[in-house]
Interface confidence: medium
């Protein structure tokens, strides 16, 4: 059990021209709030897949009204953390989706309206119990700065919050802020949050909010001395001299990222997100020009017109960001046809097609006729996931297996007599009429109203319908 915590530091227009001045539409003032969604694993999932690890909604921020002449500020944000509790093990790898919503406060028929301003998705590896990871993400013209961490609660400990820790009751030789490294206790990394003021040296708790004293100490906060003291758990390497855990530095402690870069922990290392104009492992390289090759993923670098934008990256399809460092959500272009579900796998797009459709983009209507032959010379016509037979004359039914009487509809006009034939029907016309259906009268002088009859056919002869 534990809780994922997200702290939004700022949300505002990103750098560069074309950035929006205000999140509010022309209809009037608005206020912002955030929605966080956690999904397990690092794979790209469909947008509609559920937030299986949980989700949370922030409070609404203060009302914002655009000041026409004022520079676009960072926008007023809701107070507090967004917390997503999880009951089971923390998976370690997860997808973090942060949505910025605006609530429009103009007059709305039927109540308020929400509009989605920006969505960022981050696939991360994160151990529970670690320090805050900081990040900067751009979504369209907006920039979002945030920190996040996962921590265990109650008696759960470990990087996945799966182990239970039973605090020692015996005093030890450890000094303040250190914890005994007894056998079977080396996973007891993160004790619960005790009552405010509870002595870190002489108190402990098994449930949040309580304060229980080690032997030799007393009082509501375990501050009245009577005996030797013990210590409570901090994460870190073992101290050989005391047998206690000492706090260990995390990769991002002290922020190794220079020039305003933000640090994110990665397994055994860190990653810096650099502001525009800086790059390098620690954002230590400045004064970037096209000669430095700042455009990633095959982006085309063009020199900027002013010192504030020394270069501009023109990104290839599928990438965006000031350095083409971000992969575009290609599914937003809705490439899958015929109702197919789009999956962006990073290296490729995949469409999961509805029944009856196939192809890379579900563009092909499956051959519904496969294995469904039409009998008696009928032709199969595909469409919409079901097959249909166009039957030869004289046959009918779903598969053309039923013999149809071609004379049933009385096709011979003017009293002509109908004869069923293997390839259709033959009309024997009454005197004075001709044609495949006896539809043409013959003139008294023996000349047809039509052009001359084909050779070998005389007016009044039976006409076979081909």
């Amino acid at each position: 059990a534990g809780v994922f915590e997200l702290q939004i530091h700022s949300f505002g227009p990103g750098p560069g021209p074309g950035a929006p001045r205000s999140p509010c539409s022309a209809r009037g003032p608005c206020r912002l709030f955030f929605r966080v969604c956690l999904k397990p694993g690092l794979s790209e999932e469909a947008a509609e897949s559920p937030c299986a690890l949980g989700a949370a909604l922030s409070a609404r921020g203060p009302v914002y009204t655009e000041q026409p002449e004022a520079p676009a500020p960072d926008l007023p944000l809701p107070n507090g953390l967004l917390q997503v509790p999880f009951r089971d093990a923390w998976p370690g790898t997860f997808s973090l989706i942060i949505e910025t919503w605006r609530e429009e406060l103009g007059d709305q028929i039927g109540g308020p309206a929400w509009s989605l301003l920006a969505r960022v998705t981050r696939r991360r590896r994160l151990a529970a119990g670690g320090p805050w990871a900081r990040d900067i993400q751009r979504a369209g013209a907006w920039e979002l700065r945030f920190s996040y961490r996962a921590r265990c609660e109650l008696l759960a400990v470990g990087t996945a919050c799966t182990r239970l820790c039973r605090p020692r009751s015996a005093p030890s030789r450890c000094g303040p802020g250190l914890r005994p490294c007894a056998p079977l206790e080396d996973e007891c990394e993160a004790p619960p949050v005790c009552r405010a003021g509870c002595s870190l040296e002489h108190g402990f708790c098994e449930q949040p909010g309580e304060c229980r004293c080690l032997e030799g100490w007393t009082g509501p906060l375990c501050t009245v001395p009577a005996s030797t003291s013990s210590c409570l758990g901090l994460r870190g390497p073992s101290s050989a001299t005391t047998g206690c855990l000492v706090p260990g530095p995390g990769p991002c402690d002290g922020n190794p990222c220079a020039n305003g870069g933000s640090c994110s922990e990665t397994p055994g290392s860190f990653e810096c997100t650099c502001p525009r104009g800086f790059y390098g492992l620690r954002c230590e390289v400045s004064g970037v020009t096209c000669a430095d090759g700042p455009c990633f993923n095959g982006g085309l670098c063009v020199g900027g017109a002013d010192p504030d934008s020394a270069y501009i990256c023109h990104c290839p399809p599928g990438f965006q960001g000031s350095n083409c460092e971000k992969r575009v959500d290609r599914c937003s272009l809705q490439p899958c046809r015929n109702g197919g579900l789009c999956l962006d796998l990073g290296h490729a797009l995949r469409c999961r097609c509805r029944a009856g459709f196939a192809g890379p983009r579900c563009e092909h209507n499956l051959d519904d006729c496969a294995g469904r032959a039409c009998a008696n010379g009928g032709t199969c016509v595909e469409g919409g996931g079901a097959h249909r037979c166009s039957c030869a004359l004289g046959f009918g039914g779903r598969d053309c297996r039923e013999r149809a009487d071609p004379c049933a509809a009385r096709p011979c006009a003017h009293g002509g007599r109908c004869y069923a034939h293997f390839s259709g029907l033959v009309c024997a016309c009454a005197p004075g009429y001709m044609g495949s259906r006896c539809e043409f009268p013959v003139h008294p002088d023996g000349v047809s109203a039509l052009p001359a009859a084909p050779p070998g056919l005389r007016p009044g002869d039976p006409q076979r319908y081909l």
Epitope: F33, R35, V36, C37, A47, E48, C51, G54, A55, A56, L57, S58, A59, R60, V84, I97, E99, W101, Q108, G110, G111, P112, A113, W114, S115, L116, R119
Partner: nanobody
Framework: EVQLAESGGGSVQAGGSLRLSCAAS????????MGWFRQAPAKEREGVAT????????YYADSVKGRFTISQDNEKNTVYLQMNSLKPEDTAMYYC??????????????????????WGQGTQVTVSS
């Protein structure tokens, strides 16, 4: 399977009070909304009040502001609607609903029925003058 079960409806005199309850089973509404809607005979279903899972965001229809209070109990997965100073025009079938913006929505209305994909069977509230 998601089920929403309303209770607490009944008949009351104008000026009286009722408390409606809606228990959700098979549905975790973290990050989403649960709310109350009502439908009077020959009228469209309208939003009354909605609340998010943390209780940090609530919305009320103008016609019930100051008289109705929505609250929730996460442990019990239950939402309540406390209705005070009831009026005859509050007479309607009251429905509990659960939903919220999906991840691909770009616009969502907390007090309109299309924003909710799970509905209860309803409980009747009758206010006589």
């Amino acid at each position: 399977e998601v089920q929403l079960a309303e209770s607490g409806g009944g008949s009351v005199q104008a000026g009286g009070s009722l408390r409606l309850s809606c228990a959700a089973s098979g549905y975790t509404y973290r990050s989403n909304f649960m709310g109350w809607f009502r439908q009077a005979p020959a009228k469209e279903r309208e939003g009354v009040a909605t609340i998010d899972s943390r209780g940090t965001i609530t919305y009320y229809a103008d016609s019930v502001k100051g008289r109705f209070t929505i609250s929730q109990d996460n442990e019990k997965n239950t939402v309540y609607l406390q209705m005070n100073s009831l009026k005859p025009e509050d007479t309607a079938m009251y429905y509990c609903a659960a939903g919220g913006p999906r991840t691909n929505d770009d616009r969502w209305y907390p007090l309109r029925p299309p924003g909710y994909n799970y509905w209860g069977q309803g409980t009747q509230v009758t206010v006589s003058s």
